[in-house]
Interface confidence: low
Amino acid sequence: HLIVTPSGCGEQNMIGMTPTVIAVHYLDETEQWEKFGLEKRQGALELIKKGYTQQLAFRQPSSAFAAFVKRAPSTWLTAYVVKVFSLAVNLIAIDSQVLCGAVKWLILEKQKPDGVFQEDAPVIHQEMIGGLRNNNEKDMALTAFVLISLQEAKDICEEQVNSLPGSITKAGDFLEANYMNLQRSYTVAIAGYALAQMGRLKGPLLNKFLTTAKDKNRWEDPGKQLYNVEATSYALLALLQLKDFDFVPPVVRWLNEQRYYGGGYGSTQATFMVFQALAQYQKDAPDHQELNLDVSLQLPSR
């Protein structure tokens, strides 16, 4: 059920493209294709290519993305395209000008002098933004989200975008300066991962990150469980980045117990993050436990 045909507007297309990209990434990283047959991988790659080609129709002259060509470009959507395309670079041929043009636009057009990334044109499909939805710590959460995308595109775009390292530093400065004031576990987790990627989650910040976990195994706010799966996935990625392998097993156990296999309304971010985090875990953690995740690879009929 993770392999779907992407279609629709610039937002719906990314909703459709997400599960296929992350499923292929997960199975590649964990070397599990033999369970499904390599021919299925080829079919999945064709769908990713289709999604990529379709997404280019929603690329604006500024290199940013929006739901429709005639809609103001969205910071979040553009950052998400960067994130997904950065992961897909290893799977299909992606034009680096498309990817790095979007990175450049985020930095030059959407980053304020204090490092914050601003959203002037929120996505129509609010269900696709996961725990960022109705987040009262919006500046921190969105800046962390964009920063994570920029860091994932860093190796690809550093030569084309001179301002990328400075932009990353500035956004990191903002997150670091405001981290201790965060109230929501979701924001603590996403900003924690962004800082961990930079080697800046330490001292009191690291203490806050770790003590925010409920029962030392999940980053949880009241409300939607999907957001807690997403937040805990960000936190797991941060822990793996920190090489804190003592803290990792109960978090992985909790995520595994949720039996969350992606798909369904509003699941875009939770799906992407849980599979990204668990793939990273199986790659990084010494003596990791084998995870029996139910990844079903039914290719859509043509």
Epitope: F68, K70, R71, A72, E109, K110, K112, Q118, D120, A121, I124
Partner: antibody
Framework: SLEESGGRLVTPGTPLTLTCTVS????????MAWVRQAPGKGLEYIGW??????TYYASWAKGRFTISKTSSTTVDLKMTSLTTEDTATYFC????????????????WGPGTLVTVSS | DGVMTQTPSSTSAAVGGTVTIKCQAS??????LSWYQQKPGQPPKLLIY???KLASGVPSRFKGSRSGTEYTLAISGVQREDAATYYC??????????FGAGTNVEIK
């Protein structure tokens, strides 16, 4: 083309609904904004509605003004707790080429409808 | 609401001359600025969007430009029919959007 209707003389506190009717295109693919202009004064932005029905308002208009799509060719502006300060010509305008009117501009415009609030 | 400060409030120019109108944003609005022309008894007409893009059917003598948070509308080779009031519309965010106070342009 666009045309506003519903403007009339009302007493303070009375609610009023204005309608913008479009012809030649469908609101399922277009955005619509409302702007007003007090007699002899400048333009004042009220808010807009996108093709999916999401609404965006100027901070001063939140709570008292409601924009809604009532059919594929009509958009309403509901106004409550009217005061004499709300006396103005009310214009509806489409987002240029169906886009976000704050980014791509507003074009075309209706001729406007006059609302007079007086006791 | 103080988002946009438009200057001057009125100006005049001879036919063939140049008119320059400025709008200063209270903070960064990037390209979220459009310019409108309004003649008495008529609705406004879009001239420029995205700070510098010419709207369809608008003569090329109208030019929009941006420098930081200052936006300029220049009309070169002014014609009699350009006599009107000109407004900028700037948007920091959907709820923080405003027109400038307007500039009345008279042609001598």
């Amino acid at each position: 083309s666009l045309e506003e209707s519903g403007g009339r003389l009302v007493t303070p506190g009375t609610p009023l609904t204005l309608t913008c009717t479009v012809s030649g295109f469908s609101l399922s693919r277009y955005t619509m904004a409302w702007v007003r202009q007090a007699p002899g004064k400048g333009l004042e932005y009220i808010g807009w509605i996108d093709s999916s029905g999401s609404t965006y308002y100027a901070s001063w208009a939140k709570g008292r003004f409601t924009i809604s799509k009532t059919s594929s060719t009509t958009v309403d502006l509901k106004m409550t707790s009217l005061t004499t300060e709300d006396t103005a010509t009310y214009f509806c305008a489409s987002g240029n080429d169906g886009g976000d009117p704050l980014y791509y501009g507003m074009d075309p415009w209706g001729p406007g409808t006059l609302v007079t609030v007086s006791s | 609401d103080g988002v946009m400060t438009q200057t001057p409030s009125s100006t005049s120019a001879a036919v063939g001359g140049t008119v320059t109108i400025k709008c200063q944003a209270s903070q960064s609005i990037r390209s979220w600025l459009s310019w409108y022309q309004q003649k008495p008894g008529q609705p406004p007409k879009l001239l420029i969007y995205e700070a510098s893009k010419l709207a369809s059917g608008v003569p090329s003598r109208f030019k929009g430009s941006r420098s930081g948070t200052e936006y300029t509308l220049a009309i070169s080779g002014v014609q009699r029919e350009d006599a009107a009031t000109y407004y900028c519309l700037g948007s920091i965010a959907s709820d923080d959007t405003a027109f400038g106070a307007g500039t009345n342009v008279e042609i001598k």
